[in-house]
Interface confidence: low
């Protein structure tokens, strides 16, 4: 007799989800030498323990903590680049700057990144119909819980001077309810972090508007100066241009106002 | 490794201004791989960040104190000082100087160095 199955809006794990971590922590671990020590199946394990035979509503961080503890990680703490609702361009950035790190730049992240898992409440078995979505269903899922988790950490270790990139195509720039309006600004320690500094990220060509002054950014200026924190903002007027400077900052094109 | 020292008086009176030094050692206190502060533990009670200072000579204090502090470097002595006007009572507790690595493990601020502590009594 087939087994009952909850039906969730979201989207089921994804294809093949435990080869593909495991294949990800080891190509990660071979990439970057300060983490070879990491064992990549004690990893998948823990990643595993965290959601299996879980009710998929009911996921908290410290489900998550052993994996958190095994995937510790130093990263140059005033090199962070945050980003919301603009992932591709930020990942675009890092991989030409390489001393910059977004929360995918990780191994927690990257193993992470793109994928989607749940299991169900008392079997071992993972869900590859299914999964519950943050707003239809329940906000405390695997995958939620996991970013909200994993983003509270990375930005609780940020100082100095810390970049976040924002999109400036959309209707709020600066979303309170998007992982970095709700989760990582509330985490920057003021008694490390100097200034945050947003990248507002322009997507027309003759878009040549002041969107620093736009009021979701002042929204966020707001809040992050409650915090006793320093804000700045810059226009990346032309993004093509931007990265092209990034990777050759000796053209001479790149005096002028990118 | 890095190792902290501070140095001041026991005692302050009310009203006065408490002045305490920190002597770095194992480091440049003007490296960009670290920044500064103060904590302090009242008694029974936990941590809390006093300031800090970068670098590039900016600060941050803790807004509740923020009016009566002042946190300062002298690269040429390798010192950090911390300076708390018109103390009360409430004020009394253990102070530490305490660094932050830049390349440190996450999380471990503001304990990545600090000194042993000292304690400061506020009484007439």
């Known amino acids: 007799v087939p087994r009952w199955r909850q039906q969730w809006s979201g989207p089921g794990t994804t294809k093949r989800f435990p080869e593909t971590v495991l294949a990800r922590c080891v190509k990660y671990t071979e990439i970057h030498p300060e983490m070879r020590h990491v064992d990549c199946q004690s990893v998948w394990d823990a990643f595993k323990g965290a959601f299996i035979s879980k009710h998929p509503c009911n996921i908290t961080e410290e489900d998550y903590q052993p994996l958190m503890k095994l995937g510790t990680q130093t990263v140059p703490c005033n090199k962070i680049l945050l980003w919301s609702r603009i992932k591709d361009l930020a990942h675009q950035f890092t991989q030409v700057q390489r001393d910059m790190f977004t929360l995918e730049d990780t191994l927690l992240g990257y193993l992470a990144d793109d994928l989607t898992w749940c299991g169900e409440f008392n079997t071992s078995k993972i869900n590859y119909q299914s999964c519950p979505d943050w707003r239809k269903d329940c906000s405390n899922n695997p995958v939620s819980v996991f970013w909200k988790t994993v983003s509270r950490r990375f930005a609780e270790a940020a100082c100095d001077v810390v970049h976040v990139m924002l999109n400036g195509s959309r209707s709020k720039i600066f979303d309170k309810n998007s992982t970095f309006g709700s989760v990582e600004v509330h985490n920057l320690q003021p008694e490390k972090v100097q200034t945050l500094e947003a990248w507002v990220i322009h997507g027309g060509r003759e878009d040549s508007r002041d969107l620093c002054q736009d009021p979701t950014i002042k929204e966020l200026e707001s809040i992050i100066s409650k915090r006793n924190i320093q804000f700045s903002c810059k226009n990346i007027y032309r993004p093509d241009k931007f990265l092209q400077c990034v990777k050759n900052p000796e053209d001479s094109s790149c005096t002028s106002e990118i | 490794q890095l190792q902290l020292q501070e140095s001041g008086p026991g005692l302050v009176k009310p009203s006065e201004t408490l002045s305490l030094t920190c002597t770095v050692s194992?480091?440049?206190?003007?490296?960009?791989?670290?920044?500064w502060g103060w904590i302090r533990q009242p008694p029974g009670k936990g941590l809390e960040w006093i300031g800090s200072?970068?670098?590039?000579?900016?600060?941050n204090y803790n807004p509740s104190l923020k009016s009566r502090v002042t946190i300062s470097v002298d690269t040429s002595k390798n010192q950090l000082s911390l300076k708390l006007s018109s103390v009360t009572a409430a004020d009394t507790a253990v102070y530490y100087c305490?660094?932050?690595?830049?390349?440190?493990?996450?999380?471990?601020?503001?304990?990545?160095?600090r000194g042993q502590g000292t304690l400061v009594t506020v009484s007439s």
């Open positions: 200072i970068y670098y590039s000579g900016s600060t």
């Open positions: 194992g480091g440049s206190i003007s490296s960009s791989r670290y920044y």
């Open positions: 305490a660094g932050g690595d830049r390349y440190g493990p996450v999380g471990q601020w503001p304990s990545d160095y």
